[in-house]
């Protein structure tokens, strides 16, 4: 039948009529850095060009016998998953293979670097259409490999990599940890993270999304018409490379940032059983399974945003954590989270000419995370307006006073160790949507943006006493840009965006013995771009 | 014989060369750093990627590689330049003893050095 994985990456048909997938990838070239491949396999014959690039270490063991079918196994299967005739994702995509892994599936960082350099030189010598580079490999964290990936990405190449099969934090591996690379974890037919022997898919904040990666049927190097089932984050990454090729072929001008945002936006949300991940990694790991866009049109008007978590700050008193957006994304809001609840908030600040989100640990805290909301907002002009602690009054307020600027996010930062001992502020009065409000002993930061047709509104949901979690979501057609909590007491562990929902976590009232007067409110800022909507209507 | 990419394949055990001076000592206050894989079994000691500062030209990369070879030779060490990088990152890949790391980190234009390590099919 039709393989389960191809069904899984296809969006459910919401009309009785036929789902038209985007272009099959015909304008895109996919580079595969892997083992050697069996290029005359029926699935990939005429679709894959084997380059003369080879940089592999000697096989281990004196008695190792090179057997062609074993040497070609991994690469052949992946080439089939990307563009195979019967079981491939992007059947129109052409591929080029570079051999950087030996017959045992082992390579080196240096060999991979030289392979990436080869691709860059090929691109310069003969510029073609969009390029996707698939790196179905992983090693330990490597500064140089990540740097090379960054350079290639900044040259306009889309890099897709396996998160790794070590049932571990993907940030400890390369190229999975490179922020510019699209890092893919693996799920199975039941939307469970894939278990591989005693290990399994990697997870954590360095994973961008998951994709099918268990029992994936594809070309087998045992014979030119054979098929075999393989599992791993390589297979998952191959699906995303195929989806990327189809999306880029339909819209060749897409930037890496635009492609990543679309991959996230069109993914199936909240289908993965998170219980499989270690508890401390659940909040950091995206609950997203890759899927093709529902149709070729209609995405352009969307205001796309994603959530970027920082590394953990560490526990020292003055420790901070920084979350950064990609070069062509706008930081529209900044929040923070601490499992212990001991934090000193967050602020948006300029670093190297770009806004970053910095979270501050507090004395006795186990550390904090900074959470950036990174959005695609063409022709945006954003700035941060700060109000110092009001001290005497009920709360600190700041608003967007520039003509045409709208509020996209609120942050608060305080120097006192424990805001919980101080009287909480009154909530923001109604009818003043362009205003941030916070504790009187906190400085408040408003992210104010001007962009064509940008409109935003504030949505709140409060509960009388902390109950672990309060959420508020933006309606259909609106995108969550800001997520914060009122008040900033020590009961609040922090706030963060999950897709289009603002989540505020607080200590459970039963464990803290707090009084019911300490209401916790989740405050979402929801935006949309009339300009983008009109522009896309004019195109259609 | 070097090819167009500057991939030096010869083993060098040279006498002191003109380039073995300190004409281009590293700028004051900038110390190059050494990195290696945190997973011990995956380390490949003896092969190092020497990454040079961003704006370094190919000719400077080649000169820095030759300087390392000359300085190593003076100390009685064999080195082999396996590849000179340009296009993505400036730098070179060198096969040498770990004893030479301290020396290599002091070379001009060096940003950091990373010991080679293994990657695996996933």
């Amino acid at each position: 039948s039709i393989p389960w994985n191809l069904e899984r990456i296809t969006p459910p048909r919401y009309r009785a009529d036929e789902y038209q997938p985007p272009d099959g990838g015909s304008l895109v070239e996919v580079y595969l850095l892997d083992t050697s491949i069996q290029s005359d396999h029926r699935e990939i014959e005429g679709r894959v060009m084997v380059t003369d690039f080879e940089n592999v270490p000697e096989e281990d063991g004196t008695r190792f016998h090179r057997q062609a079918s074993k040497c070609d196994s991994h690469g052949t299967h992946l080439a089939g998953v990307v563009s195979g005739r019967d079981a491939g994702v992007a059947k129109g995509a052409s591929m080029r293979s570079l051999r950087v892994l030996n017959c045992q599936g082992k390579g080196t960082v240096s060999g991979t670097l030289i392979g990436l350099e080869f691709i860059r030189k090929s691109q310069l010598v003969q510029p073609v259409g969009p390029l996707v580079v698939l790196l179905p490999l992983a090693g330990g964290y490597s500064r140089v490999l990540n740097a090379a990936c960054q350079r290639l990405a900044r040259a306009g190449v889309v890099l897709v990599t396996a998160a790794g099969n070590f049932r571990d934090d993907a940030c400890l591996y390369s190229p999975a940890s490179a922020p510019e690379v699209i890092t893919v974890g693996a799920t199975n037919a039941q939307d469970q993270p894939v278990t591989l022997g005693t290990l399994g898919t990697n997870f954590g904040r360095c994973v961008d999304l998951f994709a099918p990666g268990e029992d994936i049927i594809g070309a087998s190097s045992d014979c030119s018409t054979c098929f075999v089932s393989q599992s791993g984050t390589s297979q998952a990454a191959a699906h995303v490379a195929g989806i990327a090729a189809m999306m880029l072929s339909a819209e060749p001008e897409l930037t890496l940032a635009e492609l990543r945002q679309r991959l996230i936006h069109f993914s199936a949300k909240d289908v993965i059983n998170e219980a499989w991940f270690p508890e401390d990694q659940r909040v950091l790991t995206p609950n997203l399974v890759a899927a093709l866009p529902p149709s070729t049109h209609g995405a352009g008007w969307q205001l796309f945003c994603r959530t970027v978590w920082s590394a953990h700050s560490g526990p020292t008193r003055m420790a901070t954590a920084i979350a950064r957006c990609a070069p062509d994304e706008e930081l529209l809001s900044c929040s923070s989270f601490s499992r212990s609840g001991k934090r000193r908030g967050e602020r948006m600040e300029a670093q190297g000419g770009k806004l970053v989100c910095r979270a501050h640990n507090a004395f006795g805290g186990e550390g904090v995370y900074a959470i950036a909301r990174c959005c695609l907002l063409p022709q945006a002009n954003c700035s941060v307006h700060t109000a110092p602690p009001a001290e005497a009054s009920m709360g600190t307020r700041v608003h967007c006073h520039q003509q045409g600027h709208v509020l996209t996010g609120c942050s608060s930062h305080w120097e006192v160790e424990d805001l919980g001992t101080h009287k909480p502020p009154v909530l923001r009065p109604r009818g003043q949507p362009n205003q941030c409000v916070g504790h009187r002993e906190a400085s408040i930061h408003a992210s104010c943006c001007h962009a064509p047709g940008l409109e935003c509104k504030v949505k709140e949901h409060g509960i009388p006493a902390p109950q672990g979690q309060v959420t508020v979501a933006c309606e259909e057609g609106w995108t969550l840009t800001g997520c914060s909590a009122l008040p900033g007491t020590s009961h609040v562990l922090g706030a963060y965006a999950v897709d289009n929902t603002c989540v505020v976590r607080s200590r459970d009232v039963s464990t803290t013995g707090s009084t019911s007067e300490e209401a916790v409110t989740a405050v979402a800022i929801c935006c949309r771009s009339r300009h983008l909507a009109q522009a896309s209507q004019e195109l259609q | 014989q070097e090819d167009e990419d500057g991939d030096y394949e010869e083993l060098v055990l040279a006498l002191r060369s003109e380039e073995d001076g300190l004409a281009e000592a590293p700028e004051h206050g900038t110390t190059a750093t050494f990195h290696r894989c945190a997973k011990d079994p995956w380390r490949l000691p003896g092969t190092y990627v020497v990454v040079l500062k961003e704006e370094t030209h190919l000719s400077q990369s080649e000169r820095t590689a030759r300087r390392l070879q000359a300085q190593a030779a003076r100390r009685g060490y064999l080195t082999k330049i396996l590849h000179v990088f340009h296009g993505l990152l400036p730098g070179f890949l060198v096969k040498m003893s770990g004893d030479l790391l301290e020396l290599a980190l002091k070379l001009p234009h060096v940003d950091y050095i990373e010991e080679d390590s293994s990657v695996f099919a996933q």
């Epitope: 039709i2 459910p12 048909r13 009785a16 036929e18 789902y19 | -």
Partner: antibody, heavy 119, light 109 residues
Framework: EVQLVESGGGLVQPGGSLRLSCVVS????????MSWVRQAPGKGLEWVAN????????YYVDSVKGRFTISRDNAKNSLYLQMNSLRAEDTAVYYC????????????WGQGTMVTVSS | QSVLTQPPSASGTPGQRVTISCSGS????????VNWYQQVPGTAPKLLIY???QRPLGVPDRFSGSKSGTSASLAISGLQSEDEADYYC??????????FGGGTKLTVL
């Protein structure tokens, strides 16, 4: 393993009613349009009806409109066909089939259940 | 009377190439993709070709599909005795119905 299992067929008199069921396993039922297809003895395949993932849209072949009702219960992974005012020409093997999202085709079929309308 | 038109029968000897045609209109084949099903007597139909020319896994590459205008065809090369079955074409129609061909009985002589 992906499976569709039909039941509820049997002998019924003209004008009578019957309710067919199809129980699904091995895939996310709520992600798919589902169809009923029938085959009269010695004849070809004829599509009867289909239903959207959430049950909000239903389509029927003209010959059964107003008599047959397709429905589903996603919680029970079940598809139904309520057949009223049955006629002799409704005699057939009734198959339930999944409509592939990727392929836009009936990619998984049940084994069929026989409905005989006769006095 | 089926909406899509197929020849009622076709035959060939082992090893031969056989083609089965399927004719429709602009409201179905002309604007939609075509699927082909194989039905061995006494069993449920099986998807053979989808989206005009795509093969599900497990279908030998002896089977191929094509479409041109409002017609489609199924080709079977290297005919084998196990190919003896009924073959149906199908497509979605603008009338919001799935439509089938009347079926072609293939005999391997």
């Amino acid at each position: 393993e992906v499976q569709l299992v039909e039941s509820g067929g049997g002998l019924v008199q003209p004008g009578g009613s019957l309710r067919l069921s199809c129980v699904v396993s091995g895939f996310t039922f709520s992600s798919y349009w589902m169809s009923w297809v029938r085959q009269a003895p010695g004849k070809g395949l004829e599509w009867v009806a289909n239903i959207k993932q959430d049950g909000s849209e239903k389509y029927y072949v003209d010959s059964v409109k107003g008599r047959f009702t397709i429905s589903r219960d996603n919680a029970k992974n079940s598809l139904y066909l309520q057949m009223n005012s049955l006629r002799a020409e409704d005699t057939a093997v009734y198959y339930c089939a999944r409509e592939s999202n990727w392929g836009f085709a009936f990619d998984i079929w049940g084994q069929g259940t026989m409905v005989t309308v006769s006095s | 009377q089926s909406v899509l038109t197929q020849p009622p029968s076709a035959s060939g000897t082992p090893g031969q190439r056989v083609t089965i045609s399927c004719s429709g209109s602009s409201s179905n084949i002309g604007s939609k993709t075509v699927n082909w099903y194989q039905q061995v007597p006494g069993t449920a139909p099986k998807l053979l070709i989808y989206r005009n020319n795509q093969r599900p896994l497990g279908v030998p590459d002896r089977f191929s599909g094509s479409k041109s205008g409002t017609s489609a065809s199924l080709a079977i090369s290297g005919l084998q005795s196990e190919d003896e079955a009924d073959y149906y074409c199908a497509a979605w129609d603008d009338s919001l119905n799935w439509v089938f061909g009347g079926g072609t009985k293939l005999t391997v002589l």
